[in-house]
């Protein structure tokens, strides 16, 4: 039977009210309000907590019986829709100890992960997986691509206890792999000896000059040289004018700096390598992935342009249960929410063919009325006769 | 990478006002987060502040709230700072630095470090 | 407000391990990075996020950071590596800076 800690679908009207709060950590935080956004597959079904202010932080959350995932698999999972077509924010979830006071929530609040989609800019598409050890936010080394699209998505994390994860998208596996090998949570199990250096008579040059190579003695050249061919101007006047000197030229017979030629160093070593030895520091850690408090799960976002829609919240500690319940939610109601969406792009398309048209006949009316004012009054004449004195209707 | 170019020196009267700017290049403005920095002669590093462009909000330290204003002009992509009521222990250069912006939060750029720097502004408040 | 402190100087002879640390109240659960600053010049990030080099940033700047310290460590120290060098962090909303360390070169 699988435990489910926290599970939110917001099917209960204004229900939700109850069960999420708001943090009065600062007076001016953006509000969330329930909703299915301008697109869906199902109103009721769809419906989830949107962001409504722009340009706001938001911090919400809600609290449930606390539970420890030591000794079993931890899965957090829910569903995000940018259908603002999102500039900068954040759509991710943080799982708080039940030690958070839930009316201070806040950017600074400590909590055990952080999940889920952030797009910022050009640069910020990425999924974040944020553990906190000993302390410490630390961030995942891979760069797990988000959706960036106006559906909804579902994300997934689990977190086994053989210290392995899994970053699901839509339920199909983007990332996987080792806590340790994924996260710095630990030192490096080698470092360099510190008591190492490199030896003084170490010879990394690859080559060397060759000491038998001399400079042959006619190299030394000038660079430039008084053109041979140039001759004084007959109005030149030394008094006047002083001393006349040829221009210069390039001399054809300049060979530049001369360079001994190259050779293999005998005394090459190769690029000295730092020796490695075991880190001291170095320990391994079989609990990583294990807390001893999960009680509050939160959003604290900031948003440029609001519109983001949270909903089907799960956690709990079956894989398969998880995967149900995403099909079962995201997957019934995916297909009518892009029919939908698909649906509304073609009305405004042809909205704007028509407004468009209707822009374009305006305009021929209004230059045909300039024309009429703008050229000579007419006489009333049959049509025929009109064209036959060159007359031309517009 | 962005190239950040900051503006000329400055000698200021006590009292009076400063606006520095800082214009980036070779980047996306809005993928960074801009932080302002002083040393002052023989002292050490001092964040004033910084800006997201993106968010088009500023952050203060503690020390200069009140004082200094930051703002960003995404059109040019140029940073500003401003630092009012000018005294003679406000003699310092000044430097504005990028951190690349890797979320949406505010202290994501934290993270980061601040990985290019401008050549530094010399402000010089003397009567 | 939060602390950093750093040892005004530290000497190394060339070829040799130079360590500068950086103490602050559990500074091990925060991120901390490392500049070079030379004289008449703007600061350089040499290691971010505690342990990580910037491209271009020679192998031999390494970082670690736990419990209430957190070190920046050249190894095999070079002539050109002498600089004041500063840590800093994110600590209580807004962005910290050690006093600064002045590494010298002997010889």
């Known amino acids: 039977e699988p435990a489910v800690y926290f599970k939110e679908q917001f099917l209960d009207g204004d229900g939700w009210t109850s069960r999420w709060i708001e943090s009065k950590h600062k007076s001016d935080f953006g509000k969330f309000v329930l909703s299915s956004g301008k697109f869906y597959g199902d109103e009721e079904k769809d419906k989830g907590l949107q962001t409504s202010q722009d340009a706001r932080f938001y911090a919400l959350s809600a609290s449930f019986e606390p539970f420890s995932n030591k000794g079993q698999t931890l899965v957090v999972q829910f569903t995000v829709k940018h259908e603002q077509n999102i500039d900068c924010g954040g759509g991710y979830v943080k799982l708080f100890p039940n030690s958070l006071d839930q009316t201070d929530m806040h950017g600074d609040s400590e909590y055990n992960i952080m999940f889920g989609p952030d797009i910022c800019g050009p640069g910020t598409k990425k999924v974040h997986v944020i553990f906190n050890y000993k302390g410490k936010n630390v961030l995942i080394n891979k760069d797990i691509r988000c959706k960036d699209d106006e559906f909804t998505h579902l994300y997934t994390l689990i977190v086994r206890p053989d210290n392995t994860y899994e970053v699901k998208i839509d339920n199909s596996q983007v990332e996987s792999g080792s806590l340790e090998d994924d996260w710095d949570f630990l030192p490096p199990k080698k470092i360099k000896d510190p008591d190492a250096s490199k030896p003084e008579d170490w010879d990394e040059r690859a080559k060397i000059d060759d000491p038998t190579d001399s400079k042959p003695e006619d190299w030394d050249k000038p660079e430039h040289i008084p053109d041979p061919d140039a001759k004084k101007p007959e109005d030149w006047d030394e008094e006047m004018d002083g001393e006349w000197e040829p221009p210069v030229i390039q001399n054809p017979e300049y060979k530049g700096e001369w360079k001994p030629r190259q050779i293999d160093n005998p005394d090459y070593k190769g690029t000295w390598i730092h020796p490695e030895i075991d880190n001291p520091e170095y320990s391994p850690d079989p609990s990583i992935y294990a807390y001893d408090n999960f009680g509050v799960l939160g959003l604290d976002l900031w948003q440029v342009k609001s519109g983001t829609i949270f909903d089907n919240f799960l956690i709990t500690n079956d894989e398969a249960y998880a995967e149900e319940f995403g099909n079962e939610t995201w997957g019934v109601t995916k297909a009518a929410e892009k029919q939908m969406k698909d649906k509304q792009d073609e009305e405004q398309r042809t909205r704007r063919m028509m407004r468009t048209k209707m822009r374009m006949r305006r305009m021929r009316r209004t230059r045909r009325k300039m024309r009429r004012k703008m050229s000579p009054a007419r006489p009333r004449t049959s049509c025929r006769e009109a064209c036959l004195q060159g007359w031309t209707e517009a | 990478e962005v190239q950040l170019v900051q503006s000329g020196a400055e000698v200021k009267k006590p009292g009076s006002s400063v606006k520095v700017s800082c214009k980036a290049s070779?980047?996306?403005?809005?993928?960074?987060?801009i932080s302002w920095v002083r040393q002052a002669p023989g002292q050490g590093l001092e964040w004033m502040g910084g800006?997201?462009?993106?968010?088009?909000?500023?952050n203060y330290a503690q020390k200069f709230q009140g004082r200094v204003t930051i703002t960003a002009d995404e059109s040019t992509s140029t940073a500003y700072m401003e630092l009012s009521s000018l005294r003679s222990e406000d003699t310092a250069v000044y430097y504005c630095?990028?951190?690349?912006?890797?979320?949406?939060?505010?202290?994501?750029?934290?993270?980061?470090?601040?990985?290019?720097w401008g050549q530094g502004t010399t402000v010089t408040v003397s009567s | 407000s939060y602390e950093l402190t750093q040892p005004p100087s530290v000497s190394v002879a060339p070829g040799k391990t130079a360590r500068i640390t950086c103490g602050g109240n559990k500074i091990g659960t925060k991120s901390v990075h490392w500049y070079q600053q030379k004289p008449g010049q703007a600061p350089v990030l040499v290691i971010y996020?505690?342990?990580k080099r910037p491209s271009g940033i020679p192998e031999r700047f390494s970082g670690s950071n736990s419990g209430n310290t957190a070190t920046l460590t050249i190894s095999g120290t070079q002539a050109m590596d002498e600089a004041d060098y500063y840590c800093?962090?994110?600590?209580?909303?807004?962005?910290?800076f050690g006093g600064g360390t002045k590494l010298t070169v002997l010889g």
């Open positions: 070779g980047g996306t403005f809005s993928s960074y987060a």
């Open positions: 630095a990028s951190s690349p912006l890797r979320g949406s939060g505010w202290y994501w750029h934290y993270y980061y470090g601040m990985d290019v």
């Open positions: 800006i997201i462009p993106i968010f088009g909000t500023a």
């Open positions: 996020q505690d342990s």
């Open positions: 800093q962090a994110w600590g209580s909303s807004t962005v910290v």
